[in-house]
Interface confidence: low
């Protein structure tokens, strides 16, 4: 299985800078039924959410089982990354992206990330 998995390096600001920026985090292992609304509702309990996205199969429109979340506050991001998350009855991981560009995302996509996806995930 080879997925379209990379996420842009927003990362931390350069060393020596006083403020740490938040990053888009990848949420792995989402149940297929989880919507962006569900994600926003869940992660809002940790802090203000800037963005959520559930990645969907371009042909079928079904969830691919992973997504993204971004918070306003860096402290919220750290808190969320430090634990596993029970979302719609399934344990999910929320991690910092680390890679480069998508192998097979269409040109219009700017999302790039890497993550361990579920075994039964299809393209």
């Amino acid at each position: 299985m080879r997925g379209s998995h990379h996420h842009h390096h927003h990362g931390l600001v350069p060393r020596g800078s006083a403020v740490q920026k938040t990053s888009d985090l990848i949420v792995l292992g989402l149940p297929w039924k989880t919507t962006e609304q569900d994600l926003k509702e869940y992660f809002s309990t940790f802090g203000e959410v800037l963005m959520v996205q559930v990645k969907k199969d371009l042909k079928t429109g079904h969830s691919k089982g992973f997504g993204f979340v971004r918070f306003t506050e860096y402290e919220t991001q750290v808190k969320v990354m430090s634990q596993r998350h029970m979302i719609d009855g399934r344990w999910c991981d929320c991690k910092l992206p680390n890679s480069k560009q998508s192998q097979d995302e269409p040109l219009r996509s700017r999302k790039v990330f890497v993550g361990r996806c579920t075994e039964d995930m299809t393209e």
Partner: antibody, heavy 123, light 111 residues
Framework: QVQLVQSGSELKKPGASVKVSCKAS????????MNWVRQAPGQGLEWMGW????????TYAQGFTGRFVFSLDTSVSTAYLQISSLKAEDTAVYYC????????????????WGQGTLVTVSS | QSVLTQPPSVSGAPGQRVTISCTGS?????????VHWYQQLPGTAPKLLIY???NRPSGVPDRFSGSKSGTSASLAITGLQAEDEADYYC???????????FGGGTKLTVL
């Protein structure tokens, strides 16, 4: 087959500029990021950064900002490395390498590599 | 000074088994980032040998194997052959640097 072919060796004087090309074939150029790696004489490999071949957005490693520029010409599936204000310490072999990753891996690897371009800076 | 530490050299006789270590920290290998290995034969470009800690690309003999544990990884070569004489590099990702990183390289000499 997937191949990266780089331009030939260059001998330059200090203060001059050089542009190294890396022509890709055998795959869709815009589907994979391109990395640049430096190897000074008798030394190890040093990652210089990468360029998103979808967007043209470059990311430079620490120590490779300012005089180093990554660029693309997607119409001919070619990535470029330009170094300006050359110094003797820029003498090295410069490699381009395609970025690879899959859904089960937590960091990208480089495959294949170009054959390398020796840039010699000497007065 | 490389972020990933490798022994500068290792050696072995033909037919023997050698291992090359790659030691990182909690911001790279210890953070869960995978380790990849490259072989650089004299005068040539590096070639991918192992990716994702232990996977061999097609065409790489099964004499080469990789493993990872904690903050370090290792490359094992069994049944050493004269053509294995080369420099070997490990590579991973470092979250504190937000960049790919290489080990300093290990020169393998076949006695």
């Amino acid at each position: 087959q997937v191949q990266l072919v780089q331009s030939g060796s260059e001998l330059k004087k200090p203060g001059a500029s050089v542009k190294v090309s890396c022509k890709a074939s055998g795959y869709t150029f815009t589907s994979y990021a391109m990395n640049w790696v430096r190897q000074a004489p008798g030394q190890g490999l040093e990652w210089m950064g990468w360029i998103n071949t979808n967007t043209g957005n470059p990311t430079y490693a620490q120590g490779f900002t300012g005089r180093f520029v990554f660029s693309l010409d997607t119409s001919v599936s070619t990535a470029y490395l330009q170094i300006s204000s050359l110094k003797a310490e820029d003498t090295a072999v410069y490699y381009c390498a395609r970025d690879r990753i899959d859904g089960s891996s937590w960091s990208s690897w480089f495959d294949p590599w170009g054959q390398g371009t020796l840039v010699t800076v000497s007065s | 000074q490389s972020v990933l530490t490798q022994p500068p050299s290792v050696s072995g006789a033909p037919g023997q088994r050698v291992t090359i270590s790659c030691t990182g920290s909690s911001s790279n290998i210890g953070a869960g980032y995978d380790v990849h290995w490259y072989q650089q034969l004299p005068g040539t470009a590096p070639k991918l040998l192992i990716y994702g800690n232990s996977n061999r690309p097609s065409g790489v003999p099964d004499r080469f194997s990789g493993s990872k544990s904690g903050t370090s990884a290792s490359l094992a070569i069994t049944g050493l052959q004269a053509e294995d004489e080369a420099d070997y590099y490990c590579q991973s990702f470092d979250s504190s640097l937000s960049s790919s990183v290489f080990g300093g390289g290990t020169k393998l000499t076949v006695l």
